[in-house]
């Protein structure tokens, strides 16, 4: 008795959602009393399928509502875990084990990835010295590098940091702040990159015509 | 505490029916597999059959099929294997065992044996 | 029905030193291998599920390996209370078997 895994590692967006494949031979009709599927994350249960029905007691209450096996693919012999609203929490590697007049299992890697889409701006000018600070702040994870350029796309060195945001989630909170002596309608720009993926996402800052005073918490879009 | 007791020995002649019982303390009968395996003096482990005392379900070793029944009952956690038409060679240690995860076919918990002795 | 075989049937080993034991099985069983430790007059102890997973409670020097026909039963370093007889198992298909067993003997 032998169970595939078509894909050991699955690489999802956070807030998606992941389908995650182990197959068993089915000869003729199933016979779902017969069968007996677990998958696990780590030593939580997070389906636990025994004679013909899900057990739900056992399953660990960070995937209550949210995991699921089909048993239209179960009868074609396709132990299927969906997981929606993927959680940052939910990386990691998940077990499928199966027990059909035998048994086997394998090991699924689940990554998970949340863009640093939408990415927060301000602006703001110390009138003593006519410096700008431009300031970049997204949600997202793993950590991602802030790269400043100018309209010429030269670089520019800016002071990044990063906190781990104090939502459930535990988004990792990137604030990059950069001190530049500009003029009225100058073009900067700050690009958050994921070294590993190398996935980015970048905002435009335009330096306003008036002068803005110094205002930590007034936030343009 | 999990906990497997089974009946005590039996003396039994050649021909004749044993049924031995495994009462279950410690944990939920139902959730878990129980199966029975043997040992004859001095030799390895042999793998008789199992149930499922949820459902009733059983999986025999064929070797045994027509010899061997495997029963539950629910109302006092307790299984229980009777083979029959004894032999000689039927003479061993019987024991009872939990599976460690239902289905999953690795026995965590052990009764602490019933010696069965076939002579004339 | 799968064959498990183990060798050695009889494995003398000097207290403290490691101690190996092989189990052929014959056909690919993926990890569906258990490993028990009995002593005499005992019932059988769980050792080893998933050809390398320790039961809970088993100590560290306690590992196993192997997928597909061959498997491998290691004691980093033998403990007087190491000595009994060590039987696999496969749970891949039925019958589930076992193997004849390897006695761990003081040398």
């Known amino acids: 008795f032998t169970i595939t895994a078509p894909k050991d590692l699955y690489v999802v967006e956070y807030g998606s959602n992941v389908t995650m494949e182990c197959r068993f031979p089915v000869e003729q009709k199933l016979d779902l009393l017969a069968l007996v599927v677990y998958w696990e994350k780590e030593d939580k249960e997070v389906i636990q399928f025994v004679e013909g029905e899900e057990d739900l007691k056992p399953q660990h209450s960070s995937f209550r509502g949210r995991a699921f096996l089909p048993k239209d693919q179960l009868l074609k012999g396709n132990a299927v875990l969906q997981i929606t609203d993927v959680k940052l929490q939910d990386a990691g590697v998940y077990c499928c084990m199966i027990s059909y007049g035998g048994a086997d299992y394998k090991r699924i890697t689940l990554k998970v990835n949340a863009p640093y889409r939408k990415i927060n701006q301000r602006i703001s000018m110390d009138p003593a010295t006519s410096e700008h600070e431009l300031m970049c702040q997204a949600e997202g994870y793993p950590e991602a590098e802030v790269i400043w350029t100018n309209s010429d796309h030269q670089s520019l060195s800016g002071e990044t940091t990063v906190t781990t945001s104090q939502t459930e989630e535990k988004l990792l909170n990137v604030t990059s702040v950069l001190r530049v002596n500009a003029t009225a309608n100058d073009v900067f720009h700050c690009t958050f990159w994921r070294v590993h993926s190398g996935e980015n996402h970048t905002a435009e800052l335009i330096i306003p015509e008036l002068p803005v005073p110094r205002l930590p918490h007034n936030r343009t879009h | 505490e999990v906990q497997l007791v089974q009946s005590g020995a039996e003396v039994k002649k050649p021909g004749a029916t044993v049924k031995i019982s495994c009462k279950v303390s410690g944990y939920t009968f139902t959730s878990y597999w129980m199966y029975w395996v043997r040992q004859a003096t001095g030799q390895g482990l042999e793998w008789m059959g199992r149930?499922?005392?949820?459902?009733?379900?059983?999986k025999y070793n064929e070797k045994f099929k027509n010899r061997v029944t495997i029963t539950a009952d629910k109302s006092t956690s307790t299984a229980y294997m009777e083979l029959s038409s004894l032999r000689s060679e039927d003479t061993a240690v019987y024991y009872c065992a939990r599976d460690y995860r239902k289905g999953l076919y690795a026995m965590d918990y052990w009764g602490q044996g019933t010696t069965v002795t076939v002579s004339s | 029905d799968v064959v498990m075989t183990q060798s050695p049937l009889s494995l003398p080993v000097t207290l403290g030193q490691p101690a190996s034991i092989s189990c052929k099985a014959s056909q690919d069983v993926g990890t569906a291998v258990a490993w028990y430790q009995q002593k005499p007059g005992q019932a059988p102890r769980l050792l080893i599920y998933?050809?390398?997973t320790r039961h809970t409670g088993v100590p560290s020097r306690f590992s196993g390996s192997g997928s597909g026909t061959e498997f491998t039963l290691t004691i980093s370093s033998l403990q007087p209370d190491d000595f009994a007889t060590y039987y696999c198992q496969q749970y891949n298909s039925y019958p589930l078997t076992f193997g004849q067993g390897t006695k761990v003997e003081i040398k």
């Open positions: 149930i499922d005392p949820n459902s009733g379900s059983t």
């Open positions: 998933w050809a390398s």
